[in-house]
């Protein structure tokens, strides 16, 4: 038998330092967590003391704080070099600022294999990308060698800006071929490594035959064995065991999130490559393990360059702002109410006596919130903490749609709601009540909009015929997060200002601000 | 002592048939894929055919394809190449290897066919 | 003619470093390991390095490996007498589906 220790990420998001324990900036020292200073702690420990280790990264390094603002991914590769990773797969982040934005600092900086068995190229850019990132990559362990695939999800263009020189196939059908010539060269030890969220992480696993183990990320999803050591509730057992069609177990993993934990999976595989057991879980990347030295100097000799954004303070805070996935994907969270107003704000025209404003909803989906701002530090509101809850870049737009329109998009919100997607929409100028015991597609039993042609703004029942102005994310008027039908069916769209300028211009002309939750959105059951 | 061993080989006329065996010793067997590589007389290595440990698949080179078959039998820890409709540019030492990781990490003595008239 | 292109010979004398280069393209050296065997004259040939750049338990370390795009290499340094063989590269061609060997390349110690 031989024994195989894998170690994983994923979804990190740009969270080099280390955080609070939601993942936001680190306040207290004492009990923060994660960043790659310790990563590197713990990952040297295993190296040292284990034979047969593999540290691998399932995508989204990119995205999420003002490191990826300021360095636009070459933190990443720096820093993913110094711990020498074995292998990454790219994640759907990975695209944000382009392929360019991808091949420049990342691709051709870092010195191990970055992977996507479905991402084919094409046009100009088959030739440029070529060799940049790999289907598949083999390994040498000691003795023995292991097979990498990656995969991303083919939700990619919707979720980012690969371009239209890159084809984002199905899954199994590009990993199945990869897997069976990596089999025809008898590599018989497989690694599915890969960024399609947990879901498809099992029907990898089920359905590639040949893959003996999955890595995955994008759905951020914790799994555990025992009982969990921070908030996070484990969706499962690690390693989540899924039975494959041809009858073997297969392991499947993740990591959570944000570098908050280090996946520790052991393998064991016979002489033929078939896993014997497999058992592990993640580690908790605590206080109580130490930063390392040399990487947390290089950190802080790369942090110099952000200072200027950080030290800014913009306003002051009074209350937890809640940005978290847990609320902003589920229910009203206060960070999303924040941020519509101060989206609407930025849009006050007062240019015709009969509207008290041209416009007075707004639209954003929880998923585009990526972290929360706590509040116990001062009450300071930095351009940092800005860039961690709205990392994308994206510019906040008006559109005009009619009222069929986005009685679709509030339906299409909740269509699959409790699984932690990005497409529950926070709102502002808005009153919306869900009935969840209802079908999808026909779980909106109330939908009112407050009046812009009002001396006093009240909220009326949505008129399906009716054209509305609303401001939202680019991202959605571009059709993000499945809302195909804002893109289909938008009257007009004009582009407006960067996000994260919006809200801090907003939180600088308020001082101090404490958004509530106030019943924007309700859930109810029966008849109405 | 980790080894393989060909046989089979000798002369035979054009069009004829000759079955080389490749015996396997001092490892698992069922454990790996497996290749014949040849060798002209003077002339550089040329891969003839090979089989996957797993799943049994078989692959050919297009100089061969219709006239060879690779197959094994794990019990008797054997390779064979059954070559069919031989032809003189067939001639050549035909090489039993073990394909190990993502290569060819053990080589046979090799047996020499010689296709004459 | 063999799909991986090598020099048919090349020489050194003792002590000397040479490189023998492998050229290939995208759908085998390109996306594929090389791989690189020596074979002593009169006897089957035994692999060397594995994985591009990775050597075989008991190989000495005089002999190296790399890869980029669509070429290898093999480099010795060092060279003694009994490095005097024929050298090939070979790797899996995706196109074809089958292994590919470089022609060979006749290694002469002066």
């Known amino acids: 038998a031989w024994e195989l220790t894998i170690l994983h990420t994923n979804d990190v998001h740009s969270r080099l330092e280390q955080t609070s324990e939601d993942s936001s900036k680190c306040v207290n020292a004492s009990r923060c967590m994660g960043g790659v200073a310790r990563l590197f702690t713990k990952v040297q420990q295993i190296r040292r003391a284990e034979p047969n280790v593999l540290l691998l990264d399932a995508g989204d390094q990119y995205q999420g704080t003002i490191w990826f603002t300021v360095y636009k991914g070459a933190e990443v590769a720096h820093f993913m070099n110094a711990l020498r990773y074995d292998a990454m797969a790219l994640g759907n982040h990975e695209f944000d600022n382009g392929v360019e934005g991808l091949i420049e600092p990342l691709l051709k900086e870092a010195k191990f294999p970055i992977l996507s068995a479905n991402i084919k190229a094409k046009g100009p850019l088959a030739s440029q990308i070529s060799g940049l990132y790999l289907p598949y990559k083999v390994l040498p362990v000691g003795d023995e060698v292991v097979g990498i695939v990656g995969y991303t999800s083919k939700e990619t263009p919707f979720l980012s800006n690969p371009g239209t020189n890159l084809v984002f196939e199905d899954e199994i059908t590009a990993l199945q071929p990869e897997v069976d010539k990596l089999k025809t060269l008898n590599v018989n030890k497989i690694i599915a490594l890969g960024h399609s969220g947990f879901e498809m992480d099992k029907l990898i696993a089920q359905k590639v035959r040949g893959v003996d183990v999955v890595v995955g990320g994008h759905s951020n999803t914790f799994l555990y064995t025992g009982n969990p050591p921070s908030k996070e509730v484990p969706a499962g057992k690690y390693p989540f065991i899924v039975t494959s069609d041809d009858g073997r177990k297969v392991p499947v993993v993740q990591a959570y999130a944000f570098g908050k934990y280090l996946g520790y999976l052991k393998i064991e595989f016979d002489e033929r490559g078939n896993v014997i057991s497999s058992h592990g879980n993640p580690i908790l990347l605590n206080s109580s393990i130490p930063e390392d030295p040399s990487i947390k100097a290089d950190i802080n000799k790369w942090r110099i360059k952000l200072d200027n954004y950080s030290t800014q303070e913009l306003g002051k805070t009074i209350v937890y702002l809640d940005g978290s996935s847990q609320s902003c994907r589920f229910r009203e969270c206060n960070m999303g109410n924040l941020i519509c107003d101060a989206m609407i704000n930025n849009n006050l025209r007062h240019t015709d006596e009969m509207f008290w404003n041209h416009v007075s909803m707004c639209i954003l989906n929880g998923g585009g919130i990526r972290s929360p701002i706590d509040e116990r530090n001062n009450g300071t509101i930095t351009w940092e903490n800005l860039a961690a809850v709205l990392p994308f870049g994206g510019t906040f737009d008006l559109v005009q749609l009619k009222g069929s329109t986005l009685k679709k998009a509030f339906e299409h919100s909740v269509h699959r709601y409790g699984q932690s997607t990005g497409e529950f929409l926070q709102v502002g100028g808005i009153h919306v009540v869900y009935d969840l015991s209802r079908k999808p597609g026909d779980r909106v039993v109330k939908l009112d909009v407050l009046c812009t042609k009002c001396r006093v703004p009240s909220y009326d029942p949505l008129k399906m015929d009716e054209v509305y102005k609303v401001i939202l994310p680019n991202f959605l008027a571009n059709g993000g997060d499945g809302f195909q039908m804002i893109k289909d069916e938008l009257l007009r769209h004009d582009s407006g200002d960067q996000d994260i300028n919006v809200v801090s211009t907003y939180i600088s002309k308020m001082k101090v601000i404490y958004p509530a939750v106030e019943g924007r959105i309700k859930f109810s059951t029966g008849s109405h | 002592e980790v080894q393989l061993l060909e046989s089979g080989g000798g002369l035979v006329q054009p069009g004829g048939s000759l079955r080389l065996s490749c015996a396997a010793s001092?490892?698992?067997?069922?454990?790996?894929?497996y290749s014949w590589v040849r060798q002209a007389p003077g002339k550089g290595l040329e891969w003839v055919s090979a089989?996957?440990?797993?799943?049994?698949?078989?692959y050919y080179a297009d100089s061969v394809k219709g006239r060879f078959t690779i197959s094994r039998d794990n019990s008797k820890n054997t390779l064979y190449l059954q070559m069919n409709s031989l032809r003189a540019e067939d001639t050549a030492v035909y090489y039993c290897?073990?394909?190990?990781?993502?290569?060819?990490?053990?080589w046979g003595r090799g047996t020499l066919v010689t296709v004459s008239s | 003619q063999s799909v991986l292109t090598q020099p048919p010979s090349a020489s050194g004398t003792p002590g000397q470093r040479v490189t023998i280069s492998c050229s290939g393209s995208?759908?085998?050296?390109?996306?594929?390991?090389v791989n690189w065997y020596q074979q002593l004259p009169g006897t089957a040939p035994k692999l060397l390095i594995y994985?591009?750049?990775q050597r075989l338990g008991g190989v000495p370390d005089r002999f190296s490996g790399s890869k980029s795009g669509t070429s290898a290499s093999l480099a010795i340094s060092g060279l003694q007498s009994e490095d005097e063989a024929d050298y090939y590269c070979?790797?899996?061609?995706?196109?074809?589906?089958?292994?590919?060997f470089g022609g060979g390349t006749k290694l002469t110690v002066l």
């Open positions: 001092g490892f698992t067997f069922s454990s790996y894929a």
């Open positions: 290897a073990r394909l190990g990781y993502s290569t060819i990490d053990l």
């Open positions: 070979a790797t899996w061609d995706d196109s074809l589906k089958g292994w590919l």
């Open positions: 995208l759908s085998n050296i390109g996306r594929n390991d």
């Open positions: 089989i996957s440990g797993s799943w049994g698949r078989t």
């Open positions: 994985l591009n750049n």
